[in-house]
Interface confidence: medium
Amino acid sequence: AAIIPQSSACPNTEAKDFLQNVKVNLKVFNSLGAKVSSRRPSDYLNRSTSPWTLHRNEDPDRYPSVIWEAQCRHQRCVNAEGKLDHHMNSVLIQQEILVLKREPESCPFTFRVEKMLVGVGCTCVASIVRQAA
Amino acid sequence: AAIIPQSSACPNTEAKDFLQNVKVNLKVFNSLGAKVSSRRPSDYLNRSTSPWTLHRNEDPDRYPSVIWEAQCRHQRCVNAEGKLDHHMNSVLIQQEILVLKREPESCPFTFRVEKMLVGVGCTCVASIVRQAA
C-alpha cells in the first residue's frame, strides 16, 4: 500500500489503487502496551541447541528502519557436551512481516506497505534420512 | 498509524505534520516476490526437539486478518528417544510485527498501525541451574 501525502508538489493519482477517503497517520501504537517496547533482548540465541546470530538489516527509507535477521550458526545442533550432533539439523524459523517502505523516486514521503520474509530464530530438528528404494 | 478519512463524523487531521494526512494505495507488495506468497508451511513445528502448535488469531478488522501464533507443546524438550529431557527447556521465540487495525466502529474508515508481539516458533535451551550461595 503506497502512502502518499496530499501535497501540491506530488502528482495526483487517478489510479484504481488509491482511495481518496482513506487517510493514514504514521504514529505507531503498541497493542500490547509496555509488553512490546520494554521487553529485554532474549539470550536464547546463545543458549539454544540451535544457536543463531542476528544481522542488522538497516534501511533509512523503511519503517522499522532496523530489522534484525537471524541466521543459524551451524548446520547441525549442539549436544549436551557442546559438540555438533550430525543427526540433528539447525533450521531457520521464518516469518512474514509488514514494513512501510518509502519510495524516494516518485515523490517525497511516498510510502507503500511491503511484505518481507525474515528469519526470527533457529530450532533443532531430526535429520530426515532418505531410505534407499 | 491511524488512517483517517475525510469525513465530517471522523476527526479531521489539520496537523502540521503532513505524514498524518496521506493517501493509501491498496496493493501490498512482496519485497521478495513469489518467495513470500508461495512458500509452503514448514513441518518444523512437529519435527523440532521443541515442537509447537499454531493457534489461529483472527480479527476481521485487522490486516493481516489471520495471524498464526505459536505455543510450545511442552515445557521441556524432546530427546532422540522421544522422551522429555528435564535438563532442557522449550522456549518461545517471539517477534514484534506491524499490523493495520480498524479504529472504533464509530469511524469505520479509520485505521492505525499497531505493533504486536507474536510467537513464531520454539527452540530448545539448556535449563539455567541456580547455584545455592
Epitope: - | 491498496l26 476481521p60 485487522r62 490486516y63 485505521f111
Partner: nanobody, 119 residues
C-alpha cells in the same frame, strides 16, 4: 477463477433510486467482507460501503448514510447496493470488490457499472 460482475447502473433523475447487483463466483463468498467503491469522472476512488461476512455489520461513507443500503445474499453469492435519493454527486462508476481489510488491497475487482444522475 474469481469473477465479480456488477449490473444495475444507468441514467436516473435526481431523487430517484437504483439497485446495483454484483454476482460473485470462484470463491467462498460467505467467507469475505465485500465492498462497494466508486470513481466519479476525473476524481479518485472512494470507498462507499462495506458489509461483513454474515451481513450483520455494514459501514458507509458519511455522504451516503441514510440513502444507500448495502446487503448480501450468501445463498445466491450476490452483493447489492440500494441507492435512494440519488444526487448529481453520486454519478460515478461503481465497483464491487472483495478483499481483506480495505486500506491495503482488494484481491479482486468487478468491471464496474456506470451510474449517471442527471435531469
Amino acid at each position: 477463477e474469481v469473477q465479480l460482475v456488477e449490473s444495475g447502473g444507468g441514467l436516473v433523475q435526481p431523487g430517484g433510486s437504483l439497485r446495483l447487483s454484483c454476482a460473485a463466483s470462484g470463491f467462498t463468498f460467505s467467507s469475505y467482507s465485500m465492498y462497494w467503491v466508486r470513481q466519479a469522472p476525473g476524481k479518485g476512488l472512494e470507498w462507499v460501503a462495506e458489509i461483513k461476512q454474515d451481513g450483520s455489520v455494514q459501514y458507509y461513507v458519511d455522504s451516503v448514510k441514510g440513502r444507500f443500503t448495502i446487503s448480501r445474499d450468501n445463498a445466491k453469492n450476490s452483493l447489492y447496493l440500494q441507492m435512494n435519493s440519488l444526487r448529481a454527486e453520486d454519478t460515478a462508476v461503481y465497483y464491487c470488490a472483495k478483499g481483506e481489510i480495505l486500506p491495503l488491497y482488494f484481491d479482486y475487482w468487478g468491471q464496474g457499472t456506470l451510474v449517471t444522475v442527471s435531469s
